[in-house]
Interface confidence: medium
């Protein structure tokens, strides 16, 4: 399987909400022996590998923000810890996997990584990640709502979080 980032850059005004999204695609084994662990973290663009270093998002580690389920099942973080920090990660039946950040501040700007680990019990773990940039802007140059720039083309799209 692979992970695709729908957008490589999100530009948002301060105070807005944004949902960063990754999609898992390709063959997904739905057997009892296979589960998926999905999470988010902040990182930096390393010289060797992007998303190598795992930094917290608003003081929450990748362990705090994880989802764990079998196949393309729906799941979301319901624990108070994430919600107290204005965060919620979710996964749907179609392989979409997202994190919603509420009330953005300039400190939220940076590189965000989604991580998916396919766990085949008694055999192996296969892990892949996707990366995207979030720029939070303030002042007259800031957009009125979030603008997302697709990974594969230059056309932008206005988005708002639920």
């Amino acid at each position: 399987f692979k992970v695709a980032t729908l957008y490589s850059l999100y530009v948002c005004p301060e105070g807005q909400n944004v949902t960063l999204t990754c999609r898992v695609f390709g063959p997904v084994d739905k057997g009892h022996d296979v589960t998926f662990y999905k999470t988010w973290y902040r990182s930096s663009r390393g010289e060797v590998q992007t998303c190598s270093e795992r930094r917290p998002i608003r003081n929450l580690t990748f362990q705090d923000l994880h989802l764990h389920h079998g196949g393309h099942q729906a799941a979301n973080t319901s624990h108070d810890l994430a919600q107290r920090h204005g965060l919620e990660s979710a996964s749907d039946h179609h392989g979409n996997f997202s994190i919603t950040m509420r009330n953005l501040t300039l400190l939220d700007s940076g590189l965000y990584c989604c991580l998916v680990v396919e766990i085949r019990h008694h055999h192996s773990e296969h892990r892949v990640h996707g990366a995207m940039e979030l720029q939070v802007q303030t002042g007259k140059d800031a957009p009125s709502s979030c603008v997302a720039y697709p990974s594969s083309s230059q056309e932008s799209e206005n988005i708002t979080a639920a």
Epitope: T35, T39, F62, Q63, H66, H122, E125, R127
Partner: antibody, heavy 118, light 106 residues
Framework: EVQLQQSGPELVKPGASMKISCKAS????????MNWVKQSHVKNLEWIGL????????SYNQKFKGKATLTVDKSSSTAYMELLSLTSEDSAVYYC???????????WGQGTSVTVSS | QIVLTQSPAIMSASPGEKVTMTCSAS?????MYWYQQKPGSSPRLLIY???NLASGVPLRFSGSGSGTSYSLTISRMEAEDAATYYC?????????FGSGTKLEIK
């Protein structure tokens, strides 16, 4: 504060069985796997196996199948390892350690010393 | 199973000296992890994903490598670094550790 508190040292007779406990606190128990590691003078560190409190799934090092049985009690956030038919080769320090998938064992218990002797 | 061979088995270094130890895997692994253990204590995570420092680990520690060859470096040896260091792989079951490198202070 993340803590893994293991049960105390054990002196057991050959052929007997015993159970070590590992009580977790300070984190979401079901968000990690609980791993068990054996440390003896002969073999240094050996991974015994893991259990996922999320779904009770286990994975064992083939070498320890039939020797170790891993279980969890989610209600008390406690992991257990039962060691069966003990021999002198099972004398060692046993550690529990938590691990998030795709990561490493970032917190370890203090270790439980097991001595098998008649 | 993947066998991890660490070398040297024992080494000593003076304070301020640069220290490098290696871990060789019998088959290619995606990432390497390093742990430090002092006598009477539990292992402590030092390096994850080959080159990233775990929380609270001093910047004098670094990791590198790929495929079957990995290394752990201490840029300037300090007395508190005297310990045994283990490499470990999570790429395939059963997960395995190296036999350890014991680092002593001169």
């Amino acid at each position: 504060e993340v803590q893994l508190q293991q049960s105390g040292p054990e002196l057991v007779k050959p052929g007997a069985s015993m159970k070590i406990s590992c009580k977790a606190s300070g984190f979401s128990f079901t968000g990690y796997t609980m791993n068990w590691v054996k440390q003896s003078h002969v073999k240094n560190l050996e991974w015994i196996g893991l259990i996922s409190p999320y779904n009770g799934g286990t994975s064992y090092n083939q070498k320890f199948k039939g020797k170790a049985t891993l279980t969890v009690d989610k209600s008390s956030s406690t992991a257990y390892m039962e060691l069966l038919s003990l021999t002198s080769e099972d004398s060692a320090v046993y550690y529990c350690a938590r691990r998030a998938y795709g990561y490493a064992m970032d917190y370890w218990g203090q270790g439980t010393s097991v001595t098998v002797s008649s | 199973q993947i066998v991890l061979t660490q070398s040297p088995a024992i080494m000593s270094a003076s304070p301020g000296e640069k220290v490098t130890m290696t871990c060789s895997a019998s088959s290619s692994v995606s990432y390497m992890y390093w742990y430090q253990q002092k006598p009477g204590s539990s292992p402590r995570l030092l390096i994850y994903d080959t080159s990233n420092l775990a929380s609270g680990v001093p910047l004098r520690f670094s990791g590198s490598g790929s495929g079957t060859s990995y290394s752990l470096t201490i840029s300037r040896m300090e007395a508190e670094d005297a310990a045994t260091y283990y490499c470990q792989q999570w790429s395939s079951y059963p997960f395995t550790f190296g036999s350890g490198t014991k680092l002593e202070i001169k």
